[in-house]
C-alpha cells in the first residue's frame, strides 16, 4: 500500500508517457489520475514500467473499478495483466475474442499461469460452449489446452470445433479424453472420403471402438505403429490377425519391436499361434494349437 502524499509541483501527469518511468512509487500514486490511466491504458504497455511501478498503477485501477475492470480497460492491460490475481479476473466479464487474444499474447511463450487459466475459464463459461474460433485461438497459444480439460468440459465442445484441432493438440490427452473427442471427430469428418478421413481422424483414434477399427482395416489405411500403440487395448483385443495386418499394411512388421508392450502384448496373447505365424514376424505367446478358448465373460452373461 502506497501512502497518500501530495503531488510535487509540476509533476502532475497530463498523459501516460515514458517520462513516468522516472517517477518514484509515491509520485506515481500522487501524480497519476486513475481515470486518465484508464483511458490511456494502451500506452502503458509501450513503456518499460518496473514490477513495483505496475503495482501502483494496478492499485489505482482497483480503486477506480472495485467491482472489476470494464472490457475497454481489460483489452489494453498488456503486461499489467500479469499482475492480476485469479480473484481479480473472476470479477471480469470478457466477451470479445480480441480481448482474449490480446491478453494471451502477453503470456506467449510461457506456460499457462493461474491467471490465464482463470481468464480462459471465465471466457468459455461466458460463451456457453467452446466454439471453433475460441478453440482455434486457445490451441494456437497453448497446444496442450484441450488435454487440460476434463471429459465433462470436453463434452461441451461442438463437433464443428474439432476442425480447429491439430495432431499436436492431442499429444497429452489420456484415453478418457479421447473417448469424448473421438465421436465428435467422427461426426465432424463423416463427409470426407477414405484417405482424407483417415488423415483427419488418425490423432483421435485413441478413443475408437473395435467396430470402427474393423471398418478402417477394410480401407487400406496403412496405420503407423505410433498410432496403433495409442489405441485402446479393449478395442484392439477382438481384432483378428488378418484385420490387424490389413489395418497396418506395410507397417505390420513393426509389431515385432513392440511385442512386449501394450496393446500388442495383450493382443498377441489372444491370438492363435498359427495365425500369428502367418505374419512371418516370429511373434510368440499366442494360444497353442489344439487349445480351446473360452470367453468367460460371455458365459457369465448367459448364466
Amino acid at each position: 500500500e502506497v501512502e497518500k502524499t501530495a503531488c510535487p509541483s509540476g509533476k502532475k501527469a497530463r498523459e501516460i508517457d515514458e517520462s513516468l518511468i522516472f517517477y518514484k512509487k509515491w509520485e506515481l500514486e500522487a501524480c497519476v489520475d486513475a481515470a486518465l490511466l484508464a483511458t490511456q491504458m494502451d500506452r502503458v504497455n509501450a513503456i518499460p514500467f518496473t514490477y513495483e511501478q505496475l503495482d501502483v498503477l494496478k492499485h489505482k485501477l482497483d480503486e477506480l473499478y472495485p467491482q472489476g475492470y470494464p472490457e475497454s480497460v481489460i483489452q489494453h492491460l498488456g503486461y499489467l495483466f500479469l499482475k492480476m490475481s485469479p480473484e481479480d479476473i473472476r470479477k471480469w466479464n470478457v466477451t470479445s475474442l480480441e480481448t482474449l487474444k490480446a491478453l494471451l499474447e502477453v503470456n506467449k511463450g510461457h506456460e499457462m499461469s493461474p491467471q490465464v487459466a482463470t481468464l480462459i475459464d471465465r471466457f468459455v463459461k461466458g460463451r456457453g460452449q467452446l466454439d471453433k474460433d475460441t478453440l482455434d485461438t486457445l490451441t494456437a497459444f497453448y497446444p496442450g489446452y484441450l488435454c487440460s480439460l476434463s471429459p465433462e468440459e470436453l463434452s461441451s465442445v461442438p463437433p464443428s470445433s474439432i476442425w480447429a484441432v491439430r495432431p499436436q493438440d492431442l499429444d497429452t490427452c489420456d484415453p478418457r479424453q479421447l473417448d469424448v473427442l473421438y465421436p465428435k471427430a467422427r461426426l465432424a469428418f463423416q463427409n470426407m472420403n477414405g484417405s482424407e478421413y483417415f488423415v483427419k481422424i488418425q490423432s483421435f483414434l485413441g478413443g475408437a471402438p473395435t467396430e470402427d477399427l474393423k471398418a478402417l482395416s477394410q480401407q487400406n489405411v496403412s496405420m503407423d505403429l505410433a498410432t496403433f500403440m495409442k489405441l485402446r487395448t479393449d478395442a484392439v483385443l477382438p481384432l483378428t490377425v488378418a484385420e490387424v495386418q490389413k489395418l497396418l499394411g506395410p507397417h505390420v512388421e513393426g509389431l515385432k519391436a513392440e511385442e512386449r508392450h501394450r496393446p500388442v502384448r495383450d493382443w498377441i496373447l489372444r491370438q492363435r499361434q498359427d495365425d500369428l505365424d502367418t505374419l512371418g514376424l516370429g511373434l510368440q505367446g499366442g494360444i497353442p494349437n489344439g487349445y480351446l478358448v473360452l470367453d468367460l465373460s460371455m458365459q457369465e452373461a448367459l448364466s
Partner: nanobody
Framework: VQLVESGGGLVQPGGSLRLSCAAS????????VAWYRQAPGEQREPVAA???????IYADSVKGRFTISRDNAKNTVYLQMNSLKPEDTAVYYC??????????WGQGTSVTVS
C-alpha cells in the same frame, strides 16, 4: 527469459563504454526496454528507456552523454556511455517486457569510473 549484460569495465573519467544486453527469444524487438543502474547502497534506478514505438528518454543526470539503441535482428539493446563521470559508477542492468514485469533480472555488468 535470459538477459545477459556485457561491456562494463574500469574506465577513466571522460572515457567511454558501450554496454550490450542480449535476450533470449524476440523480447527486445517487440517490447519497451530500459537500462537501469544500481550504485553501492542505492536503489536500482532507470537511466535510459526506449518505448516499443522507438522513442527514447533519459534521466536528467545522463542526458546528452548516454544513448540507448537496439538491434532487433540481434535481439540486443545497447547503451553508449560517453563523458563518463565517477558518479556513473554502478552495476548496469537492462530489462523489458515479460521479465521486467515478473521482476526477473540478469547479472548486470559493472562499470567503474575512476
Amino acid at each position: 527469459v535470459q538477459l545477459v549484460e556485457s561491456g562494463g569495465g574500469l574506465v577513466q573519467p571522460g572515457g567511454s563504454l558501450r554496454l550490450s544486453c542480449a535476450a533470449s527469444g524476440s523480447m527486445f524487438s517487440i517490447n519497451a526496454v530500459a537500462w537501469y543502474r544500481q550504485a553501492p547502497g542505492e536503489q536500482r534506478e532507470p537511466v535510459a528507456a526506449m518505448t516499443s514505438g522507438g522513442s527514447t528518454i533519459y534521466a536528467d543526470s545522463v542526458k546528452g552523454r548516454f544513448t540507448i539503441s537496439r538491434d532487433n535482428a540481434k535481439n540486443t539493446v545497447y547503451l553508449q556511455m560517453n563523458s563518463l563521470k565517477p558518479e556513473d559508477t554502478a552495476v548496469y542492468y537492462c530489462n523489458g517486457g515479460w521479465s521486467l514485469v515478473m521482476d526477473y533480472w540478469g547479472q548486470g555488468t559493472s562499470v567503474t569510473v575512476s
